[in-house]
Interface confidence: low
């Protein structure tokens, strides 16, 4: 019978400000009151399914009841008016949703941009969250003409793209209106010429041309965006080598007006460079374009800029009157080779005698020389020309090397193995550093590097491993030949030994025992052995620990008990920790030698 509601709630669709007060009234219809035999006293108010305490109700008259909320904190409140009918059954009369939120704040930071070829877009800061549907409208006008409103879309409420084409050199006034159910506010107006808001398209068709005459330059050309007919452009040109991650920039003052080419100077020969370019209005008013697509080019070759590192090794087993000498050199890095290396030229001149020439593709040359003094030179050649020569004196067989470096030290730092020394008083032409891994299982295979004569500290430029003992040799090289080599051992990073020492008895007496052990093989040391600890105990006694210097290979335990089983083990320690060796047992005799019961 009662298809239409039993009553209604006023107001029907309330929108209220957060933390404000609100009153709703439920009015019952006469036919409903008659049907259910109820009046306003029977009304039960509920929010979100929960009954509101009666103390919040006011009975206005027999048909109407009100409820008041103070400090509304919920964004959405489902409010229902219900009546208690016969048998305390609840009957829903009407329901509403109270929506709460905040009025809009004044929009701030209004700014506009004209992307070349597109219409003007403006954006702003809409202020705090209102929790309500809030509409933003961008308004714009000339002094003589009003443009159509731009209504921001729901998914992008703080920006809008206008519907009209941009006209340059005429000022436009722009502002934003924000409106919701609780109020309406307007931003500050901004007035500008759209030409000062332009973001040009990036320059395109960027290309790079090299020069055979100059190996240090590359010429860039590009096509400017169409906006060049409206504004004067300035540019940023950036470049980097192909493998670099950071960009260098041409000084902006060199590219401060419209152009379509530029020559980049002071580049490295035979190097691939990557370029990009962007542009904007020359007075800096507006926006930089996006970067152009990248373009790359390779500078022309130049002759090698440096002589290679050059050294020699003499085979110790030499035939009467002759010796086998291996000349060795290092490949130049690309930034010194300045092109594709074709070959190496070696000359050997016996002291004040004839000259021998060799053209070599490898980085070593083995020759048989007499016991005389020789002068060796080495040049490297590419398409453009030859490097300066590296010169090496190979002294006569009876040469006595002197003047070593002093205070040689080696130490790890920042994951590198550093070597330093005090320079000799004599004038050193260069230093040769050689290093190899000491091992009981394999020969010491040497790597090497060359340093200028002015250097007294450097790091080893090889692939070094942790926990390996490196034998490092530094040889000063003088005009008349090499000086005395000095050597030192070092670790890139130490670790505890892989094995501990194996202890045994050398001699056992009634009250003492002489223990002995072998030095640990270098392959298991993993670092410098700093000290040993001997641990010994009886089956029932506490363990005793004795520290022993790492130079020792035997130790005497004294004050032992006769006729007693002892357990002994030994640990070796590097700077990074220790490792125990196997446990060994021995028994002291009941009587000393010659002693009877």
């Amino acid at each position: 019978e009662l298809l239409d509601p039993c009553g209604y709630i006023s107001p029907e669709s309330p929108v209220v400000q957060l933390h404000s007060n609100f009153t709703a009234v439920c009015v019952l219809k006469e036919k409903c009151m008659d049907y259910f035999h109820v009046n306003a006293n029977y009304i039960v108010w509920k929010t979100n399914h929960f009954t509101i305490p009666k103390e919040q109700y006011t009975i206005i008259n027999r048909t109407a009841s009100s409820v008041t909320f103070t400090d509304i904190a919920s964004l959405n409140i489902q409010l229902t008016c219900n009546i208690l009918t016969f048998g305390q059954l609840e009957q829903n009369v009407y329901g509403i949703t109270i929506i709460s939120g905040l009025p809009p704040e004044k929009p701030k930071n209004l700014s506009c941009i004209v992307n070349e070829g597109k219409k003007m877009r403006c954006e702003w800061d809409g202020g705090r969250e209102t929790h309500l549907e809030t509409n933003f409208t961008l308004k714009s006008e000339w002094a003589t003409h009003k443009f159509a409103d731009c209504k921001a879309k729901r998914d992008t409420p703080t920006s809008c793209t206008v519907d009209y084409s941009t006209v340059y050199f005429v000022n436009i006034e722009v502002w934003v209106e924000a409106e919701n159910a609780l109020g309406k506010v307007t931003s500050d107006h901004i007035n500008f010429d759209p030409v000062y808001k332009v973001k040009p398209n990036p320059p395109h068709n960027l290309s790079v041309i090299n020069s055979e005459e100059l190996s240090s330059i590359l010429k860039l050309t590009w096509t400017n965006p169409s906006i060049k007919s409206v504004i004067i452009l300035k540019y940023n040109i950036q470049y980097r080598t192909k493998d670099a991650s950071t960009w260098s920039q041409i000084p902006p003052e060199d590219t401060a007006s419209t152009r379509s080419s530029f020559t980049v100077q002071d580049l490295k020969p035979f190097t691939e460079y990557v370029f990009r370019i962007r542009c904007m209005k020359e007075d800096g008013k507006g926006y930089w374009s996006d970067w152009s697509e990248e373009a790359s080019g390779i500078t022309y070759e130049d002759r090698p800029s440096k002589a290679p590192s050059f050294w020699y090794k003499i085979d110790p087993s030499h035939t009467q009157g002759y010796r086998t000498v291996q000349l060795v050199w290092k490949t130049l890095p690309p930034f010194e080779a300045n092109g594709k290396i074709l070959d190496y030229e070696v000359t050997l001149t016996r002291w004040k005698s004839h000259l021998q020439n060799y053209t070599v593709n490898a980085t070593k040359l083995t020759v048989n020389l007499t016991n005389d003094r020789y002068l060796a030179t080495l040049t490297v050649r590419n398409l453009v020309g030859k490097s300066d020569a590296a010169v090496l004196t190979i002294p006569a067989c009876d040469f006595q090397a002197t003047h070593p470096v002093m205070d040689l030290k080696a130490f790890p730092k920042d994951n590198m193995l550093w070597v330093e020394w005090t320079t000799p008083r004599e004038s050193v032409k260069k230093y040769i550093l050689e290093w190899c891994v000491l091992s009981d299982k394999a020969p010491c295979i040497t790597d090497w590097q060359q340093e200028d004569g002015t250097v007294h500290r450097t790091y080893l430029r090889g692939n070094l491993a942790e926990s390996k003992c490196y034998l490092i040799t530094v040889t000063p090289v003088y005009a008349d030949g090499p000086g005395s080599p000095e050597s030192i051992k070092a670790y890139l990073k130490q670790a505890p030994p892989s094995k501990g020492p194996t202890v045994r008895t050398k001699k056992v007496g009634k009250n003492e025992a002489v223990l002995e052990w072998d030095q640990l093989p270098v392959d298991v040391q993993n670092g410098f052995i700093r000290n040993y600890t001997i641990f010994y105990r009886t089956i029932i006694g506490n363990e005793t620990a004795v520290n022993v210097d790492s130079s020792h290979t035997e130790y005497t335990l004294s004050s032992l008990t006769s006729d007693t089983l002892y357990m002994v083990r030994m640990a070796a320690y590097t700077d990074e920790g220790g490792k125990d060796g196997p446990e060994f047992t021995f028994t002291t005799p009941k009587f000393a030698q010659g002693e009877i019961e």
Epitope: A73, S74, L75
Partner: antibody, heavy 120, light 108 residues
Framework: QLQLQESGPGLVKPSETLSLICTVS??????????WGWIRQPPGKGLEWIGN???????YYNPSLKSRVTISVDTSKNQFSLKLSFVTAADTAVYHC????????????WGQGTMVTVSS | DIQMTQSPSSLSASVGDRVTITCRAS??????LNWYQQKPGKAPKLLIY???SLQSGVPSRFSGSGSGTDFTLTISSLQPEDFATYYC??????????FGQGTRLEIK
């Protein structure tokens, strides 16, 4: 994401007061759209609603337990608590705290529950 | 108080079966009805709210229907992880919030 964790003694003597705390993490207990509730489940039986609390402090209790129940909130610690006085063996149950979504009218997130035994 | 009655109180079914559980309210509760799933030793988990709305993250094989006094929970194709106890709950006339006595769903 939001999580609830019940804590409190597992054994309470008859006639004493059962006290439990529910700690809310990953969200604010003062949130506008949620109530916070306690539900219990005696061993092998169904679910019984104890009461709900709104972040502002207003409470709603099951009339069958109303005289013995107090639910309160400590917003600074993001916790709400249950006190049930004059307990008997019939109050032995797993006690769950849960979040009541006022828009859906349902307990949408639950704590894993804590077993409370009433025994001397 | 509004009483909620579930039927059956227990039922056996096989993986792949279509299963229906019903819940009846002692008076009209409009569509203020929720369904929960509870596995042994775990907390209940909300499946359906407002009679037919699927809770986020719940598989679509679960569905709810009904309004007034009669409601159903349907599992369209039973999966091994669905064997549990299911509870209905009304939120129309509160306090108190009331639950059904539960329906235990077992493997046949």
């Amino acid at each position: 994401q939001l999580q609830l964790q019940e804590s409190g003694p597992g054994l309470v003597k008859p006639s004493e007061t059962l006290s439990l705390i529910c700690t809310v993490s990953g969200g604010s207990i003062s949130s506008n759209n949620y109530y916070w509730g306690w539900i219990r489940q005696p061993p092998g039986k169904g679910l019984e609603w104890i009461g709900n609390l709104y972040g502002s402090g207003s409470t709603y209790y099951n009339p069958s337990l109303k005289s013995r129940v107090t639910i309160s909130v400590d917003t600074s610690k993001n916790q709400f608590s249950l006190k049930l006085s004059f307990v008997t063996a019939a109050d032995t149950a797993v006690y769950h705290c849960a979040r009541w979504d006022t828009n859906g009218g349902a307990f949408d997130i639950w704590g894993q529950g804590t077993m409370v035994t009433v025994s001397s | 108080d509004i009483q909620m009655t579930q039927s059956p109180s227990s039922l056996s079914a096989s993986v792949g079966d279509r299963v229906t559980i019903t819940c009846r309210a002692s008076q009209s509760i409009s569509s203020y009805l929720n369904w929960y799933q509870q596995k042994p030793g775990k907390a209940p988990k909300l499946l359906i709210y407002a009679a037919s709305s699927l809770q986020s993250g719940v598989p679509s094989r679960f569905s709810g229907s009904g309004s007034g006094t009669d409601f159903t929970l349907t599992i369209s194709s039973l999966q091994p992880e669905d064997f549990a106890t299911y509870y209905c709950q009304q939120s129309y006339s509160t306090p108190p919030i009331t639950f059904g006595q539960g329906t235990r769903l077992e493997i046949k």
